[in-house]
Amino acid sequence: HPIPDSSPLLQFGGQVRQRYLYTDDAQQTEAHLEIREDGTVGGAADQSPESLLQLKALKPGVIQILGVKTSRFLCQRPDGALYGSLHFDPEACSFRELLLEDGYNVYQSEAHGLPLHLPGNKSPHRDPAPRGPARFLPLPGLPPALPEPPGILAPQPPDVGSSDPLSMVGPSQGRSPSYAS
């Protein structure tokens, strides 16, 4: 269930968050979502340049996802199949972000309501969008412009995996514990 908006609003950062989207859903092996140079989307066991993503709030509760290395936006066809596009199409490439209580997030196509899933290992023509939402844990990537602050031992602000640390997402969103980079 999405968390009720009971936490104080977090006042730092802008609207882009650099993240790896990790999933360990039962229907596939543990994987990081990656957007490849040829526009295909898949999962990689380890973090890679192709799996470093920028999650950006477009409007409250809705984000776009950009592959940093490939400059391709994550998009979804009406059948649920994922692809990476150099051209941002609001209809195909906007995702509603739902933050779950356990720190995982669920992403749904804003246009079709279909959940975001990594393609399975089976034939690409079978079951491109399995039923039930896939859960992703947004893991921090290095900030794109700023170097990592040296050895911070104090607790980090609990933004965290949200693409939207300023609570720019919808009114009933919570926060996820993949701590801010």
Epitope: G14, Q15, L58, K59, P60, L66, V68, S71, L166, P171
Partner: antibody, heavy 117, light 107 residues
Framework: EVQLQQSGPELVKPGASVKIPCKAS????????MGWVKQSHGKSLEWIGD????????INNQNFKGKATLTVDKSSSTAYMELRSLASEDTAVYYC??????????WGQGTSVTVSS | DIQMTQSPASLSASVGETVIITCRAS??????LAWYQQKQGKSPQLLVY???TLAEGVPSRFSGSGSGTQFSLKINSLQPEDFGSYYC?????????FGGGTKLEIK
């Protein structure tokens, strides 16, 4: 049709404050951020800040810290920007905008603010 | 803050010509660049965002390109209504900043 309706020109004295309204129509007010932009005469554009109409959370340009305060009234689908301690350099046209991922996809017609004694 | 530098500051062209306006960012802004058109005494209008996505209702003679720090707006077959000022803006991370503008005049 999306429309952002701003109020008419303002002539204010140095040191005074002014509050500019921007009434949104043609879309669901809480579905998009509202922003404000300054344009001094014959000059380029300066982003002042954005506000989330759902919760009133703002992102501000530090250059306008202490100068501009952004608020919303959800019941009337209206965004407001208050400018205080006005000085001659605040003379400009101020636009309200609808934000979409930082791009500004709709603009009000602008409110001219003239600071003069 | 990220600085946006536009060139040229002004240019003259004739109806039917093709023009290119360029914009440089002081650091990598990835795919987060927008272009606006402003006519005298009017509000700016969004033309392009995310480098190359045309805003609703914008004619296909406008096209954006570039990546990282270097970007351009191309206008094919200039029409009389295309004359005015053009601004680039990064929408990578706040504060969003604009270029100084390019004034496009009729030759």
């Amino acid at each position: 049709e999306v429309q952002l309706q701003q109020s008419g020109p303002e002539l204010v004295k140095p040191g005074a404050s002014v509050k500019i309204p921007c009434k949104a129509s043609g879309y669901t007010f809480t579905d998009y951020y509202m922003g404000w932009v300054k344009q001094s005469h014959g000059k380029s554009l300066e982003w002042i800040g954005d506000i989330n109409p759902n919760n009133g959370v703002t992102i501000n340009n530090q250059n306008f810290k202490g100068k501009a305060t952004l608020t919303v009234d959800k019941s009337s689908s209206t965004a407001y920007m208050e400018l205080r301690s006005l000085a001659s350099e605040d003379t400009a046209v101020y636009y309200c905008t609808r934000g979409y991922g930082g791009a500004l996809d709709y603009w009000g017609q602008g409110t001219s603010v003239t600071v003069s004694s | 803050d990220i600085q946006m530098t536009q060139s040229p500051a002004s240019l003259s062209a004739s109806v039917g010509e093709t023009v290119i306006i360029t914009c440089r960012a002081s650091e990598n802004i990835y795919s987060y660049l927008a272009w606006y058109q402003q006519k005298q005494g009017k509000s700016p209008q969004l033309l392009v965002y995310n480098i190359r996505t045309l805003a609703e209702g914008v004619p296909s003679r406008f096209s954006g390109s570039g990546s990282g720090t270097q970007f351009s707006l191309k206008i094919n077959s200039l029409q009389p209504e295309d004359f005015g000022s053009y601004y680039c803006q990064h929408h990578y991370d706040s504060p969003w900043t604009f270029g100084g503008g390019t004034k496009l005049e009729i030759k």
